[in-house]
């Protein structure tokens, strides 16, 4: 039976890398079989030499070399952009047009946005070599070379972020010549070589001067979570402080912070975090639902100045960001026991006030929910008839119920003499396993 054309396989965006030809695929159905023709930026391709395009019998377009295009700096498009290809499939009943596929060519420009600079660092302190790679398509990756060889990155000591190399603790062996290399499918570019010298810490003569520094911690503000960090980021605060005293002898500032304990209790130890700022900075990695104390300390090399005043901030509670763990269902005498383990501590997001337990519909229990208050991690539910019992559990903070656990099910047989909880070595059933068994 005759039918109009339909595109089955659309052409895909591609990078022309050469030296071999680029291929654009297009497949269509239809009766009579449709004829395929290709368009570039809406204009039909001639396919006649010197046109670099060639059509294969199956409708695939071969591009032997990149098509000619305007001056790269016409301001209308990047030189990467070779155009948009579409295919048309036609028979006597009509024409189908594919989605457009962009053909681009790999490019790596020569000019670095930021070149690494020569620097002197102190043993034990952190230092950063900045690098902003040239514009490239595809976007280039950055690697670092030291003394002519690729730098072996040590987790916890080296971090490459946004092109820059952060060295957590300088060692004498870090001395040398560093180079940032930007690479993509068009090739690679090398930055200038930056000389890094590492000095032993000085016996500072400024500590007396540093002791005269006064720091006023002015405010601590809870930052709005960055949507890019996902739905459940850890909270971060913005610290702002003022420095008075001698002319800026401090080389760096450290935040000291701890959770507040009950009045009269032994204070928690202060955690320390080096701040990336001289008057204000962000401090992350905190926990929701905690009361924190914050202060700031100036330092210069190994010398420390006096701590600032202490400011308090209560971080609001959030709902728990993980479900209770190890949820199990066990049969009892005319009852079913539900037990669980609290979510991991880092996911509490406040004080767990209790738990919510739901029974799921379409089982022997009608849909219902129970609230378990306090630290109790089990619940006994009365059962009146054989059949399947499925529950979910969620932890509750002052902000509400968090993420529920996966449904866990138990199948009670006729006389409730024994409960089927197959396969036994795998613990309770999931809803999926239960459905599969009931189907069998």
């Amino acid at each position: 039976q005759d039918s109009p054309p339909q595109i089955l396989v659309h052409p895909q965006d591609q990078l022309f890398q050469g030296p071999g030809p680029a291929r654009m695929s297009c497949q269509a159905s239809g009766q009579p079989p449709p004829t395929i023709r290709w368009l570039l930026n809406g204009q039909p391709l001639s396919m006649v030499p010197p046109d670099p395009h060639h059509l294969l019998p199956d409708g695939t377009l071969l591009l032997l070399q990149p098509p000619a295009r305007g001056h790269a700096h016409d301001g209308q498009a990047l030189s990467t952009d070779l155009g948009v290809y579409t295919c048309e499939a036609s028979n006597r009943l009509g024409t189908a047009v594919s989605r457009g596929a962009r053909l681009s060519v790999a490019v790596l420009r020569e000019d670095f946005q930021i070149q690494p600079r020569d620097m002197v660092a102190v043993v034990g302190e952190q230092f950063t070599l900045e690098c902003g790679p040239p514009w490239g398509h595809p976007e280039p990756t950055v690697s670092w070379w030291k003394d002519g060889k690729p730098l072996a990155l040590q987790p916890g000591r080296h971090t490459v972020s946004g092109g820059s190399l952060l060295m957590a603790r300088a060692e004498k062996s870090d001395e040398g010549t560093y180079m940032c290399v930007a690479t993509n499918s068009a090739g690679h570019r090398e930055s200038r070589a930056a000389r890094v010298s590492i000095q032993e810490p000085q016996d500072y003569t400024e500590p007396v001067e540093l002791l005269a520094v006064r720091i006023q911690l002015e405010n601590v503000t809870l930052l709005n979570p960055d949507p890019a960090e996902g739905p459940k980021p850890r909270p971060a605060v913005w610290l702002s402080w003022k420095v008075s005293g001698p002319a800026a002898p401090a080389q760096s500032y450290t935040a000291l912070f701890r959770t507040q304990t009950a009045p009269g209790g032994q204070g928690a130890p202060w955690a320390e975090e080096l701040l990336a700022g001289w008057q204000s900075a962000e401090l992350g990695g905190l926990h929701w639902g905690q009361d924190y104390e914050f202060k700031v300390r100036p330092s210069s090399g190994r010398a420390r100045g006096p701590d600032s005043n202490v400011l308090l901030l209560r971080l609001p509670e959030k709902v728990p960001s993980a479900p209770p763990q190890e949820v199990t269902l066990k049969p009892g005498n005319g009852t079913v026991f539900v037990s669980w383990v609290p979510p991991p501590a880092e996911n509490h997001n406040g004080i767990i006030r209790g738990y919510q337990v739901w029974s799921l519909g379409n089982t022997s229990l009608p849909p219902a929910n129970w609230t378990v208050v306090g630290e109790q991690t089990q619940l006994e539910i009365a059962t009146h008839m054989p059949g399947s019992y499925c529950v979910q559990v969620a932890a509750v903070t002052g902000a509400g119920a968090g993420e529920p656990s996966r449904p866990v099910c138990l199948l009670l047989e006729q006389a409730m003499e024994r409960a089927t909880q197959e396969p036994s070595e795998h613990g309770p059933w999931t809803l999926e396993q239960l459905r599969a068994t009931l189907k069998r």
């Epitope: 952009d81 070149q115 040239p134 595809p138 976007e139």
Partner: antibody, heavy 118, light 112 residues
């Protein structure tokens, strides 16, 4: 036709936060680096931030480093500027602009006004 | 940071006459690869800036040929061969050779 439309400006108190958006259309957003530029009333233009086309590389002047974050969502053809710890001197019209390589800003949006005042 | 200065800061012009604006940088805008990244923009009253000249001397598409740019190192010039009424506004130079990118203070061009 290249179009850039900023939104999200408004009045905010010192120390507050604001998030600007820039909706792009008429070009393949994911192959262009993008920038934010601002202009305080009666003042010269000031470059605020730049982001590479894939979002890996970001650049800021010292005046906003640590307070402002530029980001992008290529699936939504949208550029963002998250501004924290705002100060009175951040009051300005904020423009988003398209970059050709890192050579020049060719198209600019109409701007959105941010006022930081108590 | 590189400081950009412009002169004059105000330029009253006569229609049909030529005009010239100077832009100076506190250090050379030539990078390691001998490339120069200096651009000129016009901001008409109540509008966003628009690109006129990129990389010292390249006219952006749609910009009339009465506009031309020249210069090297630290000294750059924008010339208008015959000023027209639509050319009024503030002209800015911008260097993007070195981060942070910096603008000149602007030159206000109006009709005498």
């Amino acid at each position: 036709e290249v179009q850039l439309v900023e939104s999200g400006g408004g009045l905010v108190q010192p120390g507050g936060s604001l998030r600007l958006s820039c909706a792009a259309s008429g070009f393949t957003f994911s192959t262009y680096a993008m920038s934010w530029v601002r202009q305080a009333p009666g003042k010269r233009l000031e470059w605020v931030a730049t982001i590479s086309q894939g979002g890996t590389y970001t650049y800021y002047p010292d005046s906003v480093k640590g307070r402002f974050t530029i980001s992008r969502d290529n699936a939504k053809n949208t550029l963002y500027l998250q501004m924290n710890s705002l100060r009175a001197e951040d009051t300005a019209v904020y423009y988003c602009a398209r970059l050709i390589y890192y050579d020049y800003l060719d198209y600019w949006g109409q701007g959105t006004l941010v006022t930081v005042s108590s | 940071d590189i400081v950009m200065t412009q002169s004059p800061l105000s330029l009253p012009v006569t229609l049909g006459e030529p005009a010239s604006i100077s832009c100076r940088s506190s250090q050379s805008l030539e990078n390691e690869n001998k490339n120069l990244y200096l651009n000129w923009y016009l901001q008409k009253p109540g509008q966003s800036p628009q690109l006129l000249i990129y990389r010292v001397s390249n006219r952006f598409s749609g910009v009339p040929d009465r506009f031309s740019g020249s210069g090297s190192g630290t000294d750059f010039t924008l010339k208008i061969s015959r000023v027209e009424a639509e050319d009024v506004g503030v002209y800015y130079c911008l260097q993007v050779t070195h981060v942070p990118w910096t603008f000149g203070p602007g030159t206000k061009v109006d009709i005498k």
